[in-house]
């Protein structure tokens, strides 16, 4: 028998220095968690302790935190390179910048493979990217080999900016002739590295003849055996077993997300390559890990950079953006307008003719903008001004909620209006009428929302069967401020950019802003 | 059919620097792991390097290692052998192999090219 | 580095005889090993690979085993054209070893 240690992280997101333990900025050193420095003091330890080793990561380590926004992947290739990772898979978020975004920044300089098996490459930009990232990667790992074959979620055009030239193949379809070649070349041992979700990992599992193991991302999936470290709620044992359709046991695993554990699986092969037994956890990178001081002092080198740019003019606002809780609790706010528009025009995609946008609404809580920005200072607006705004650190992600839902959301929205709570939403691309002398859960008299399969887009009223898609920021996704009908009943769910960069992304564009109040929400009754 | 044609031998001076090519046909050239082996004359065979199926890994024999480079074009379906500081000892026939299963099968052998290192 | 020993350095034999030759090496070698036939003035050939699995096209008088350190070549009765000299190959960690070889002659 033979012993194989994957070591495996996803859904990194940028998060190169420690982080608090809900991954968003770290502020109490010594309760810190994650971070390359201390992923990298585990991975030596591990390295040294045993013989047959891999590190792996399953995509999505752009976009998240001022690391991405300055560096735009430089940040990735370094690090990753630093910690010797043996293979990555491509994300949807890696193609954020656009192709080139990822070709210059990591493809060119990445020194360990970058796969994905169900992206193919057309017109001139085939010969462009040829061999910049690959199918599969066979490695060599102690005195045997060990086929890793990549997959990307077919979902990136809508969530991402591929480009035309890239094609999102079915993960299965592209996937079975890879492994099947993998096969005839003798290569007995295959890893399923990719970045479509847990239940398309499963779905890998069951149906991919020839794949031993699947090591996921994309759907930030905690899976744990025995009693979780630390906050997260295991969705299944780790790793997660699949019985294939040709009757094997595969192993399934994913690593949560933000760098916070390492995914750690133990993985033993008979002579003919098939999986014996599979045993392991995710490693909580906490404290008790000291940070390696060589890549500590290059992350505080690299640091100094951003600690600039936070202060740099992104662009002008030539009115006030109304950003306090008396306002954007209570009525519609023009901060919550600009940050609405920001993430539709975040989310332009036009993949279909019939389509003008594949998303026209957003619904954003009142409760998550944080400060108002003056326009007496100049105008000038800096990342340290819209960091006071969304000092959370969250993300803007897309959604697909039935009219129900929405209906059910907008009624939370005032369900106990007056009290200065933060579930009060401002929205875009949806006008909304209450009438608070209505009793709560009854107080939407009026719902439009802008079309989306149109030419020229237009306000319909809301149809309570149909799916819509949804821009919203992930602690609504997750069910914050009472938003639980999200949660439970979302169809879809795909983790979208960090929330300061796509407003900043935004203003950057506009060069100059001027949001207004303009009737996007209303109140039927006189006294508002 | 696979044919392997070595090309490049000849006579060098010693601490000179002789380039070997291995032009491949009749496979997939970038789908498998090429080897250098070379035998002095009347003796027996000295594996000398590999090189992986799209050129990530290399790995050498120590009695070459730092004066031989191994690499390959697959665009071309060739193999190179670099051999610089050439010894007296580096004399013999080199064979370009290929690797049909990660080190287990060299199972396609070229007829080899001499090299000669002679002041 | 591991050394490999054949023997016998030479084996005189008639057709028809059975040939049995030997490889050791100085550590494991697993399962890694192979043999190879040479004839003057030609190129190797591969024999068996994985110590046991005979190449394509080899006949089925040409049989391997053994693992770890000790390995055998056994040539059931010999043919005309099976005297020359053989060759075990080891490898380990990407190394590769040939033994000195065992030259198969007529007696």
């Known amino acids: 028998a033979w012993e194989l240690t994957i070591l495996h992280t996803n859904d990194v997101h940028s998060r190169l220095e420690q982080t608090s333990e809900d991954s968003s900025k770290c502020v109490n050193a010594s309760r810190c968690m994650g971070g390359v420095a201390r992923l990298f003091t585990k991975v030596q330890q591990i390295r040294r302790a045993e013989p047959n080793v891999l590190l792996l990561d399953a995509g999505d380590q752009y976009q998240g935190t001022i690391w991405f926004t300055v560096y735009k992947g430089a940040e990735v290739a370094h690090f990753m390179n630093a910690l010797r990772y043996d293979a990555m898979a491509l994300g949807n978020h890696e193609f954020d910048n656009g192709v080139e975004g990822l070709i210059e920044p990591l493809l060119k300089e990445a020194k360990f493979p970058i796969l994905s098996a169900n992206i193919k490459a057309k017109g001139p930009l085939a010969s462009q990217i040829s061999g910049l990232y690959l199918p599969y990667k066979v490695l060599p790992v102690g005195d045997e080999v060990v086929g890793i074959v990549g997959y990307t979620s077919k979902e990136t055009p809508f969530l991402s900016n591929p480009g035309t030239n890239l094609v999102f193949e079915d993960e299965i379809t592209a996937l079975q002739p890879e492994v099947d070649k993998l096969k005839t070349l003798n290569v007995n041992k295959i890893i399923a590295l990719g970045h479509s979700g847990f239940e398309m990992d499963k779905l890998i599992a069951q149906k991919v003849r020839g794949v031993d193991v699947v090591v996921g991302g994309h759907s930030n999936t905690f899976l744990y055996t025995g009693n979780p470290p630390s906050k997260e709620v295991p969705a299944g044992k780790y790793p997660f077993i699949v019985t294939s359709d040709d009757g094997r046991k595969v192993p399934v695993v994913q690593a949560y997300a933000f760098g916070k554990y390492l995914g750690y699986l133990k993985i033993e092969f008979d002579e003919r390559g098939n999986v014996i037994s599979s045993h392991g956890n995710p490693i909580l990178l906490n404290s008790s890990i000291p940070e390696d001081p060589s890549i500590k002092a290059d992350i505080n080198k690299w640091r100094i950079k951003l600690d600039n740019y936070s202060t740099q003019e992104l662009g002008k606002t030539i009115v006030y953006l109304d950003g306090s809780s008396q306002s954007c609790r209570f009525r519609e706010c023009n901060m919550g307008n600009l940050i609405c528009d920001a993430m539709i025009n975040n989310n332009l995609r036009h993949t279909d003719e019939m389509f003008w946008n594949h998303v026209s609404m957003c619904i954003l809580n009142g409760g998550g903008i944080r400060s108002p920005i003056d326009e007496r200072n100049n105008g000038t607006i800096t990342w340290e001004n819209l960091a006071a705004v969304l000092p959370f650190g969250g993300t803007f992600d897309l959604v697909q909620l039935k009219g129900s839902t929405l209906k059910k959301a907008f009624e939370h929205s005032v369900h106990r209006y007056g009290q200065s709570t933060g579930e009060f939403l401002q929205v875009g691309g949806i006008h909304v009428v209450y009438d608070l002398s209505r009793k709560p859960g009854d107080r939407v008299v009026k719902l439009d929302v802008l079309c989306t399969k149109c030419r020229v887009p237009s306000y319909d009223p809301l149809k309570m069967d149909e799916v819509y898609k949804v821009i919203l920021p992930n602690f609504l996704a997750n069910g914050g401020d009472g938003f639980q009908m999200i949660k439970d009943e979302l169809l879809r769910h795909d983790s979208g950019d960090q929330d300061i960069n796509v407003v900043s992304t935004y203003i950057s564009k506009m060069k100059v802003i001027y949001p207004a109040v303009e009737g996007r929400i209303k109140f039927s009754t006189g006294s508002h | 059919q696979v044919q392997l044609v070595e090309s490049g031998g000849g006579v060098a001076q010693p601490g000179r620097s002789l380039s070997l090519s291995c032009a491949a046909s009749?496979?997939?050239?970038?789908?498998?792991?090429m080897h250098w082996v070379r035998q002095a004359p009347g003796k027996g065979l000295e594996w000398v390097a590999l090189i992986w199926y799209e050129g990530s890994f290399e790995y050498y024999a120590d009695s070459v290692k730092g004066r031989f480079s191994i690499s390959r074009d697959n665009s071309k379906n060739t193999l190179y052998l670099q051999m610089n500081s050439l010894r007296a000892e580096d004399t013999a026939v080199y064979y370009c192999?290929?690797?049909?299963?990660?080190?287990?099968?060299?199972?396609?052998w070229g007829q080899g090219t001499l090299v000669t290192v002679s002041s | 580095k591991i050394v490999m020993t054949q023997s016998p350095a030479t084996l005189s034999l008639s057709p028809g005889e059975r040939a049995t030759l030997s490889c050791r090496a100085s550590?494991?070698?697993?399962?890694?090993l192979a043999w190879y036939q040479q004839k003057p003035g030609q190129a190797p050939r591969l024999l068996i690979y994985d110590a046991s699995n005979r190449a394509t096209g080899i006949p089925a008088r040409f049989s391997g085993s053994g693992s770890g350190t000790d390995f055998t070549l056994t040539i059931s009765s010999l043919e005309p054209e099976d005297f020359a000299v053989y060759y075990c190959q080891q490898r380990s960690n990407w190394i590769f070893t040939f033994g000195p070889g065992t030259k198969v002659d007529i007696k």
């Open positions: 192999v290929r690797d049909a299963q990660w080190g287990s099968r060299l199972d396609y």
């Open positions: 550590q494991s070698v697993s399962r890694y």
């Open positions: 009749g496979f997939t050239f970038s789908d498998y792991g």
